[in-house]
């Protein structure tokens, strides 16, 4: 048999008019019950019994996982990155078969010079991390390589990385146009064939806090939304206070249902409250008060 827990009750009336009695104890306070039989059925919404309590799945909480949280943790990555696949043609080095072997002295030296050259080319780009040669082939030396970009996550990270990729394109085009062979000789660190410069592909980290929020909110996805504070995204329901989208329930408690957030209005000893936002107070008559 279930143990009886003495708690005072407060009568709550939903905005639709039904009166609900709820315990006035904090829902997060553990309530000890002595339960006989299968515990699994006690945990709702996919929660499971760990021997002591219900372990709830997002977005649920509560003794039986019956309540919906007001906010869901979403963790954007600290940094976001972009990878640009580029090809340039170096004319100041003649291709030899040893360049195909990434552990050869030839490759290591070429890699060192090429990296130095690209570090100079991209030195003014704060997002620039480095280059990675993926393949060298004949012609003089066709260099297939990745340019790596990284920036701190902000809501505008895509714009920042898109801008950086544009600057990379401008800078590589400029250097491969200016640093060219003269009389079969190169006076620069490396010389290039202007027509051999190509951007093959650009891959940008995909992180969408709205999508993560919706996924974690599951069947409540239409009612959870993302708001930012100090450039950090928060996945909240209207029942979470302190945000632009927060629902003000005045004399009531905000509760999530599958139809969205609703206010459960309080009935006190002196007043009952109604209305969508529990802002309409009606004083109880004297005799009703003493009944």
């Amino acid at each position: 048999p279930l143990a009886t827990i003495p708690v005072s009750t407060t009568s709550l009336t939903s905005s639709e008019g039904s009166t609900i009695s709820t315990p006035s104890v904090d829902i997060s306070t553990p309530v000890t019950t002595s339960i006989v039989g299968d515990q699994c059925s006690r945990c709702k919404n996919g929660g499971f019994w760990d021997g002591l309590k219900c372990q709830c799945l997002t977005p649920y909480y509560g003794e039986s996982c019956e309540e919906v949280v007001n906010s869901i943790d979403i963790a954007p990555p600290e940094t976001v990155s972009a990878q640009m696949e580029l090809t340039v043609t170096v004319t100041s080095v003649k291709f030899t078969d040893e360049l195909k072997n990434h552990s050869s002295q030839e490759f290591r030296e070429f890699n060192k010079t090429f990296t130095e050259q690209m570090n100079i080319v991209y030195s003014g780009i704060p997002e620039y991390v480095g280059v990675n040669i993926t393949n060298l082939r004949l012609g003089s030396v066709v260099v297939e390589h990745d340019v790596l970009l990284r920036t701190k996550y902000t809501p505008e990270y895509k714009t920042a990385l898109d801008n950086a990729t544009e600057v990379v394109k401008q800078k590589i085009t400029k250097v491969t146009t200016e640093q060219i062979m003269t009389n079969d000789n190169c006076s620069a660190l490396m010389c290039f064939n202007t027509t051999g410069t190509q951007v093959q592909n650009i891959t940008v980290t995909q992180y969408d806090p709205v999508e993560e929020c919706r996924q974690k909110a599951e069947e409540y996805e239409d009612y959870f939304l993302v708001e930012y504070r100090d450039q950090k995204p928060y996945c909240i329901s209207p029942c979470e206070s302190g945000f632009n989208a927060s629902k003000n329930c005045n004399h009531g408690k905000c509760q999530m249902s599958q139809n969205g957030a609703r206010c459960l209005c309080v009935t006190t000893e002196t007043h009952w409250y109604s209305g969508e936002d529990c802002n309409q107070g009606t004083q109880k008559s004297h005799h009703h008060h003493h009944h």
Epitope: S92, V93, K94, E98, T113, N185, S187, A188, L189, M190
Partner: nanobody, 123 residues
Framework: DVQLQASGGGSVQAGGSLRLSCAAS????????MSWFRQAPGKEREGVAI???????GYADSVKGRFTISQDNAKNTLYLQMIGLKPDDTAMYYC?????????????????WGQGTQVTVSS
């Protein structure tokens, strides 16, 4: 570690000749490139001549027709034959080597260096 040792410098009169040598510790660069650079006091190091394993040679405009670069792979030695020397040729001469078949007279493109040998040309 690859060692390069330059020698053969000295003092000559304008119009005179010198032959510089650069001995490599092994034949590592026989499939790459070797070069001569020079640096006059207060000036940047500049490329003088290159020779590559494919037989290609390249020269700075200022020495074309007067200097000849060559190498003896059997002896692992690089040479620079200098004739018609001018006071402007006065500098410290360095040999450099690369595993790459290079076409670059920019010193930053070269990773292995010998210590210098001084050439002084007086008028």
């Amino acid at each position: 570690d690859v060692q390069l040792q330059a020698s053969g410098g000295g003092s000559v009169q304008a119009g005179g000749s010198l032959r510089l040598s650069c001995a490599a510790s092994d034949n590592t660069f026989s499939r790459g490139s070797m070069s001569w650079f020079r640096q006059a006091p207060g000036k940047e190091r500049e490329g003088v001549a290159i020779i590559s394993s494919d037989g290609w040679t390249g020269y700075a405009d200022s020495v074309k027709g007067r200097f000849t670069i060559s190498q003896d792979n059997a002896k692992n030695t690089l040479y620079l034959q200098m004739i018609g020397l001018k006071p402007d040729d006065t500098a410290m001469y360095y040999c450099a080597a690369s595993f790459l078949v290079l076409r670059a007279l920019n010193p930053k493109a070269w990773h292995y260096w010998g210590q210098g040998t001084q050439v002084t040309v007086s008028s």
